[in-house]
Interface confidence: medium
């Protein structure tokens, strides 16, 4: 059954499901090798302009560093793919943790993207988003299989997805779960299916392992399939992956090759 | 459908021990991100937050009832326990059940039981 | 632990008037929560994360501040919306409640 439109006036914050064009979507494709060169001094400038990332990030070390310790008696650390760094392990439990960090970093992700300054000066957490991005890379290509069912829940949004065959972002780093019954606990107000290419397993390197969560990047679109609206529960949003899309590449190289040089915007 | 009962003695007298059980359906209490908390409210004033549980069995406790307060679960029975010693008719109140979601430095109570009013009494 | 302070303790307001309740926390907090509260009745989260609307509450209601200061904002009060309204912070443990705001319909 579908809302009228005076029942659908009370769902006040209906999020449009769109592209997402504030999200900073940036692959880092072709400056892979300098931004990890430029990462030990960016970390540092931002674990003094955030708190939330410093704490964040020293819970998950200790973690990280713990499992690498045990690891081999607790089988907590799956086997990493060639170039998987310590520093992906500890981004992973960062952002997986039940801590405010994946909260205010994702609402972060999602307007950092407004403009190329307001990514530059304003978003703090760019180690993080590399770092991420890198990892979904390196995980995925590690993976035999391609793509895979998902399953989203969203708690405390509703969406508001443009009709069927709309394609659409999901604007943040999404995380999802391969097993239906997990994601459902988190769906009182949205959820999703999701068939993904993109997004990769993070299982091993979850603070939750048993919630067979999978991370979906922001620059991964989809196609809107069907979406239903019933009165009693949540909404119910399915999505087919289409590709990828990115506004930005190596914004954080490009500002400093202009500021040590000629100045370099190209595309890499 | 999420939901929360909170069942135990309407009336207990003073020294006494009260026990209150929480039952939860619509949610695990494995579930890593969800917690469930004890909140009271004595007639006509303002929420007290008790004590919680997470699903990896951390516990916290109110620092001024620490010393009466245990909170225990039983994940499969989907039940809550909180269990407070040496009652006093102050602590007459409404005493709520709530799921948390999230956890420390972000969480907020979205769930709420409706409540069983305790007495204290001789 | 961090006290909450909300004022003012009890306000009325006419039908269609705008009113704006305060909560003010005794350190910083990154969020708070509001609970709306009728009487007899369970609290029902209201508006979580500072900003954000719990589903099925109307948007003439909106939450806003930060640090130490934050306030629940309505903007045309509705004979339902006559409740007792209380702030929570989570931002350091234990989490806390403020004394709460009643609001009445005059």
């Known amino acids: 059954q579908s809302y009228s439109i005076s029942q659908l006036d009370i769902f006040s914050q209906e999020t449009p499901l769109d592209m997402a064009p504030a999200s900073f979507d940036d692959q880092y494709a072709g400056c892979l090798a300098d931004m990890t060169a430029a990462l030990p001094d960016l970390n540092h400038s931002e674990f003094q302009a955030n708190k939330v990332y410093a704490d964040g990030w020293a819970q998950a070390n200790n973690q990280w560093q713990e499992r690498r310790a045990w690891g081999s008696v607790w089988g907590s650390l799956p086997p990493s793919p060639p170039g998987f760094r310590d520093e992906h392990g500890v981004a992973l439990l960062a952002y997986t943790a039940n801590s405010p960090l994946h909260k205010e970093f994702n609402a972060a992700v999602r307007e950092a993207g407004r403009s190329r300054a307001h990514y530059l000066h304003h978003f703090s957490f760019k180690t993080l988003h590399f770092l991420l991005t890198e990892a979904l890379q390196l995980l995925r290509s590690h993976r035999s299989r391609g793509c895979q069912q998902v399953y989203r829940g969203v708690h405390g949004l509703r969406f508001r997805p443009a009709g069927p065959g709309a394609t659409v972002r999901l604007g943040g780093f999404a995380s999802a779960s391969l097993k239906n019954v997990a994601a459902q606990q988190f769906g009182e107000d949205t959820f999703f299916g999701i068939w993904t290419c993109l997004g990769a397993p993070i299982r091993g390197y979850s603070f939750f392992p048993e919630e067979e969560e999978v991370l979906i990047p922001p620059f991964e679109t989809f196609q809107v399939i069907n979406t239903s609206r019933p009165t009693q529960g949540p909404a119910r949003i399915y999505l087919r992956a289409l590709g990828k899309r990115s506004t930005y590449n190596c914004e954080y190289i490009k500002e400093k090759k202009c500021r040590s040089g000629p100045c370099w915007l190209g595309s890499s | 459908q999420v939901t929360l009962k909170e069942s135990g003695p309407v009336l207990v007298k003073p020294t006494e021990t009260l026990t209150l059980t929480c039952t939860v359906s619509?949610?695990?209490?494995?579930?890593?991100?969800?917690?469930v908390s004890w909140i009271r409210q004595p007639p006509g004033k303002a929420l007290e937050w008790l004590a919680h549980?997470?699903?990896?069995?951390?516990?916290s406790y109110s620092t001024s009832l620490k010393s009466r307060l245990t909170i225990s679960k039983d994940t499969s029975k989907s039940q809550v326990v909180l269990t407070m010693t040496n009652m006093d008719p102050v602590d007459t109140a409404t005493y709520y059940c709530?799921?948390?979601?999230?956890?420390?430095?972000?969480?907020?109570?979205?769930?709420w039981g409706q409540g069983t009013l305790v007495t204290v009494s001789s | 632990q961090i006290v909450l302070t909300q004022s003012p303790a009890i306000m009325s307001a006419s039908l269609g008037e705008k009113v704006t309740m305060t909560c003010s926390a005794s350190?910083?907090?990154?969020?708070m929560h509001w609970y709306q509260q009728k009487s007899g009745t369970s609290p029902k989260r209201w508006i979580y994360?500072?900003?954000k609307l719990a589903s099925g509450v109307p948007a003439r209601f909106s939450g806003s501040g930060s640090g130490t200061s934050y306030s629940l904002t309505i903007s045309s009060m509705e004979a339902g919306d006559a409740a007792t309204y209380y702030c929570?912070?989570?931002?350091?443990?234990?989490?806390?409640f403020g004394a709460g705001t009643k609001l009445e319909l005059k």
């Open positions: 619509g949610f695990s209490l494995s579930n890593a991100r969800m917690g």
């Open positions: 709530a799921r948390i979601y999230g956890g420390d430095s972000w969480g907020y109570f979205d769930n």
């Open positions: 994360d500072t900003s």
């Open positions: 929570q912070q989570w931002s350091s443990n234990p989490p806390t």
């Open positions: 350190s910083s907090v990154s969020y």
């Open positions: 549980i997470f699903s990896n069995d951390e516990k």
